[in-house]
């Protein structure tokens, strides 16, 4: 089948890094600078991705593979193939339209990216809060109140601030 196809279509002989040049009797021509073909039999070469602005080059373009970008310091990749760079925030913050914003009461973010998440609801597992949560850290759940030895006590989380929608644990 391959042999038949190559007899019918001379372009199928053109390897990656080349293209089948219709203007030159369908001979295989190398991809021009700043372009590539990652598979054989291509009739055109694709333009190399350029990593500009907040993007920086992680891997240079070659005749057979596209350039790969990542983000400059203070930003991180989002989307397939790092299609976007998003601003880093500090731990205890999340990104909003206006920029980095502290996590609302009852939520935390222990990373420089992503969104604030609620503190763990210890009572779901029949446990109590051993260490209170902060903007940067989740609560630490401990043994259930019944499991505590006499005289020992668990930390009671502070009453929630008037943050709309927060459900105390």
């Amino acid at each position: 089948f391959e042999r038949t196809r190559s007899l019918q279509d001379p372009c199928s002989n053109c390897p990656a890094g080349t293209f089948c040049d219709n203007n030159r009797n369908q001979i295989c021509s190398p991809c021009p600078p700043n372009s590539f073909s990652s598979a054989g039999g291509q009739r055109t070469c694709d333009i190399c991705r350029q990593c500009k602005g907040v993007f920086r080059t992680r891997k240079e373009c070659s005749s057979t593979s596209n350039a790969e970008c990542d983000c400059t310091p203070g930003f991180h990749c989002l989307g397939a193939g790092c299609s976007m760079c998003e601003q880093d925030c500090k731990q205890g913050q999340e990104l909003t339209k206006k920029g980095c914003k502290d996590c609302c009461f009852g939520t935390f973010n222990d990373q420089k990216r992503g969104i604030c998440r609620p503190w763990t609801n210890c009572s779901l597992d029949g446990k109590s809060v051993l260490v209170n949560g902060t903007k940067e850290r989740d609560v630490v759940c401990g043994p259930s109140p019944a499991d505590l030895s006499p005289g020992a006590s668990s930390v009671t989380p502070p009453a929630p601030a008037r943050e709309p929608g927060h459900s105390p644990q």
């Epitope: 939520t107 609620p118 929608g165």
Partner: antibody
Framework: EVQLVQSGAEVKKPGSSVKVSCKAS????????IYWVRQAPGQGLEWIGN????????FYGEKFMGRATFTADTSTSTAYMELSSLRSEDTAVYYC??????????????WGQGTLVTVSS | DVQLTQSPSSLSASVGDRVTITCKLN????????VHWYQQKPGKAPKTMIY?????PDGVPSRFSGSGDSSSNSAFLTISSLQPEDFATYYC??????????FGQGTKVEIK
Amino acid sequence: EVQLVQSGAEVKKPGSSVKVSCKASGYTFTSYYIYWVRQAPGQGLEWIGNIWPGNGGTFYGEKFMGRATFTADTSTSTAYMELSSLRSEDTAVYYCARRPDYSGDDYFDYWGQGTLVTVSS
Amino acid sequence: DVQLTQSPSSLSASVGDRVTITCKLNSGNIGSYYVHWYQQKPGKAPKTMIYRDDKRPDGVPSRFSGSGDSSSNSAFLTISSLQPEDFATYYCHSYDSTITPVFGQGTKVEIK
């Protein structure tokens, strides 16, 4: 493909409870908020609350505090909303929706098909 | 509490008309949080038409656009040339805090 598939319509008596399920597929269930929103007949959208399935953390709208309960079963990637002490004003279509993790004020990118809950004596 | 007021609450327009829906924030700053727009048809779940103020999801026609104006503390959804499939109810959505979403009351776009 991301999908949120909700349980079927329910008819309930005043004073009873209803539990609506929302089965997620096509993404990591524990890494996105699930929001619950309702819509009374001919009315607009109203936020009930939300859950982070990763740890069961919840937030409730003031109007629904003490009456709504959200849970999540990570083994089946299913979120649940239970509403108790039902009254006729709770007759509505109840939606679950996913919020992306891009920013804290992001949109709802996927919605369930909705569950009609009718409260009638 | 933050409220979003949409205007008009309903409008009648013809195919080909340019239509603009306004979503006004009663307090706070329209620049603080993103505004999103959903289209809803009877018996269906809302569908995102515009997200993060002015971005269009894949598959949403280019006749839909979003914008904002800080002086009037408002966001706008514009349909440049109304098509038969655009007759629906449109909702704006933003936030009171990053936990608490708020919605406009909806604008019904009807055929004249």
